[in-house]
């Protein structure tokens, strides 16, 4: 995903930030109103300009500055750690007028044995340690406080939780003589929530637990536990919801089977099976009860865990997710795609679509991509004419004052948005594809031909001539 080069070279990082004590809770914040864009769809740009100008004119009247940065807070409870024993933490940007809180779980694969964790530690240490984290991060996409970039929840309290546990946010084991690494992903989330209660979360109306990739799977694994935690701590009125982006994987048959040697070629079922033991992973209780002991790995797969969840969850998933293709040993590297592989890819999209059939709140464009919600251009993709921020807004409305999605969809405000066209990038609003080798942008027609799709076969079901279809796709229609 874009805009995420935040590492600092050794010797260039600032001194570690001081561990700040929790600020006393401010007076009861006033709820800000969700924006309803129903009437302004046609003239969104000028509406946004007005909103921004209004927002900026109000800034001098408040304690907030127009500062996009989220600030690092290392956990006060230093026994809740990253893999290497350094304290876990979170980045926070408060929005005192809002009772909405967005907690975002970062992604970044995982490691599942000593060897690949050692190698990860020596090449991707920021995903295993907080030692070199920068003091601040810029909020992008759904974490942005700019209404043009984030028309959905720009005014929310933004929390970014860095992924440093390598366990798909599921682990509950600490570093010891026996364990070289701690795997505390599930505990990190609990501790962050606990600390945020002292920073204003206690007055929240809605807590949206969001995440991308491994963080998206982390949402599915932790959303009910967070709701339960808040209930037990005496905050039953906070509505907990989930937004899982690019974390809804299939335990399908790999295109080419390979032995489980490293993280990216190991079949997902086998990687998770091994990982769960190595991490002492925990899964949602209601899901765990559905499977025998030793079969908890099933709960890492969205279509199996989702039906057991109590909290409402919105699922965002590219139908042709690059991480899914990677674990399935599909590597699109510029060579024309053979028919067997083309059929495999098409079938993957079909299977994914089928698993989302009974997910009322979902957004699944037929694109080849990975992650979306913290991309700056997350507003660009549409399914059936509806953008993701708009779909999320409709979802909010459908959940208004209730903990479960209402059965009747709001008129003109859809929340179940799954592309039905059958091939990658048949949706013209998909992110631009670049030729892997020339780096040149490809239009949809070029991409499909490059993928080995026969235009005759593609055009026929649409009732079009291949030349007509090519013309339409080239024009992005």
């Amino acid at each position: 995903s874009e805009g995420r080069k935040t590492w600092r070279r050794r010797g260039q990082q600032p001194p570690p930030p001081p561990r700040t004590e929790a600020a006393p809770a401010a007076g009861q914040p006033v709820e800000s109103f969700p924006l309803d864009f129903t009437a302004v769809e046609g003239n969104m740009d000028s509406f946004m300009a007005q909103v921004k100008s209004l927002a900026q004119s109000l800034y001098p009247c408040s304690a907030q500055q127009l500062n996009e940065d989220l600030r690092l807070h290392l956990l006060l409870n230093t026994s809740v750690t990253c893999n290497d024993g350094s304290p876990a933490g979170y980045y926070l940007k408060e929005s005192r007028g809002s009772r909405r809180w967005l907690l975002f779980l970062e992604g970044g694969w995982y490691c599942f044995n000593r060897e690949n964790c050692d190698s990860r530690y020596d090449t991707m240490r920021r995903l295993m340690s907080s030692r070199d984290w920068p003091r601040t991060r810029t909020g992008t996409g759904i974490l942005s406080s700019q209404p043009e970039e984030n028309p959905y929840w720009w005014n929310a309290n933004m929390v970014f939780i860095p992924y440093c546990s390598s366990d798909v946010w599921s682990g509950a084991s600490s570093k010891s003589e026996k364990n070289e690494y701690a795997f505390m992903g599930a505990l990190i989330i609990q501790e962050v929530v606990r600390e945020l209660l002292g920073r204003g979360l206690s007055g929240a109306k809605v807590l949206l637990l969001a995440g991308s990739a491994a963080g998206g799977t982390g949402v599915l694994l932790n959303v009910d536990r967070v709701a339960e935690q808040l209930e037990k701590l005496g905050y039953p009125a906070i509505q907990v919801r989930g937004l899982a982006d690019s974390g809804w994987f299939l335990d399908n048959k790999q295109y080419r089977h390979t032995d489980c040697v490293d993280t990216i070629t190991c079949a997902p079922t086998e990687a998770i099976r091994r990982g769960i033991r190595y991490w002492n992973g925990v899964v949602p209780e209601r899901c765990r009860r559905q499977f025998q002991e030793g079969e908890e790995w099933n709960c890492f797969f969205g279509y199996k865990v989702y039906p057991t969840l109590r909290c409402p969850v919105f699922v965002v998933q590219w139908l042709f997710d690059e991480a899914q293709l990677t674990v399935d040993n599909v590597h699109l590297t510029g060579q024309p795609v053979q028919e067997g592989l083309r059929l495999y890819i098409q079938n993957l999209g079909r299977e994914l679509r089928h698993t989302l059939k009974d997910v009322p709140a979902s957004f699944a464009p037929a694109c080849l991509s990975h992650e979306i919600i913290i991309r700056s251009h997350w507003t660009d993709v549409q399914v059936k004419g509806t953008s993701l921020p708009r779909a999320l807004h409709c979802w909010d409305r459908s959940l208004h004052d209730s903990h479960k999605a209402s059965k009747t969809p709001l008129k003109g405000c859809p929340v179940h948005l799954v592309d039905s066209c059958p091939w990658p990038h048949c949706n013209p609003s998909c992110p631009t594809v670049r030729d892997q080798f020339t780096g040149q942008e490809m239009n949809v027609a070029q991409f499909l031909m490059h993928m080995g799709f026969d235009m005759q076969t593609v055009a026929q079901p649409q009732g079009l001539e291949p030349s007509e279809l090519l013309g339409m796709l080239s024009n992005g229609s």
């Epitope: 995420r4 080069k5 050794r10 694969w109 060897e115 090449t123 240490r125 920021r126 990677t326």
Partner: antibody, heavy 119, light 111 residues
Framework: DVQLLESGGGLVQPGGSRKLSCAAS????????MHWVRQAPEKGLEWVAY????????YYADTVKGRLTLSRDNSKNTLFLEMTSLRSEDTAMYYC????????????WGQGTSLTVSS | DIVLTQSPASLAVSLGQRATISCRAS??????????IHWYQQKPGQPPKLLIY???DLESGVPARFSGSGSGAAFTLNIHPVEEEDAATYYC?????????FGSGTKLEIK
């Protein structure tokens, strides 16, 4: 100043053994994964082996597997490469390199030690 | 194993002109927003020297005429404007997974 200094090269008979060393200074050795990279005369770079920062994981290129043993002594800031059953194709300049932990790139290289396998 | 194919094997560029070297991986070396491709320069009798890391970040002390780009499986090293001292062999290297591998090298000659 960050420095890596290889030693132990020289002339060895085919089938013979040799132990190369790499002495590190100017940085916390135990913080970094270390690698050996070799270069045959007039040829390109070939990655040979990796030792994790704690020394608990080692990984070898297929071309050398079974004939090389990589180890490190973090208390002495030294990396070792023990080579057995040497062949003429092992003739090369052997470099020890430090891998940056925010990407795995080699941000520091030694000057190399030359090994010749010949009868 | 990931195979890196570097091209061209050699090139001659006039002083002040642009040199472009390509590196293709047999599968994607990008993940979680980072591309694990790095570029080195090697002159005869010397060890390699890091120029570009993580596809596009310039190593400190390296002149700004060196730049890197690309993602997924396709990467490029550009040198512009080329200077006399840039005559050397250039290698790409991936650290996405073990085993690490290098490209076969590109020898740059200044005309």
């Amino acid at each position: 100043d960050v420095q890596l200094l290889e030693s132990g090269g020289g002339l060895v008979q085919p089938g013979g053994s040799r132990k190369l060393s790499c002495a590190a200074s100017g940085f916390t050795f135990s913080d970094f994964g270390m690698h050996w990279v070799r270069q045959a005369p007039e040829k390109g770079l070939e990655w040979v082996a990796y030792s994790s920062s704690g020394g608990t994981t080692v990984y070898y290129a297929d071309t050398v597997k079974g004939r090389l043993t990589l180890s490190r002594d973090n208390s002495k800031n030294t990396l070792f490469l023990e080579m057995t059953s040497l062949r003429s194709e092992d003739t090369a300049m052997y470099y020890c390199a430090r891998a940056s932990y925010d990407g795995g790139y080699f941000d520091c290289w030694g000057q190399g030690t030359s090994l010749t396998v010949s009868s | 194993d990931i195979v890196l194919t570097q091209s061209p094997a050699s090139l001659a560029v006039s002083l002040g002109q642009r040199a472009t070297i390509s590196c293709r991986a047999s599968k994607s070396v990008s993940t979680s927003g980072y591309s694990y491709i790095h570029w080195y320069q090697q002159k005869p009798g010397q060890p390699p020297k890091l120029l570009i890391y993580l596809a596009s970040d310039l190593e400190s002390g390296v002149p700004a005429r060196f730049s890197g780009s690309g993602s997924g499986a396709a990467f490029t090293l550009n040198i512009h404007p080329v200077e006399e001292e840039d005559a050397a062999t250039y290698y790409c290297h991936h650290s996405r997974e073990l085993p690490f591998t290098f490209g076969s090298g590109t020898k740059l000659e200044i005309k």
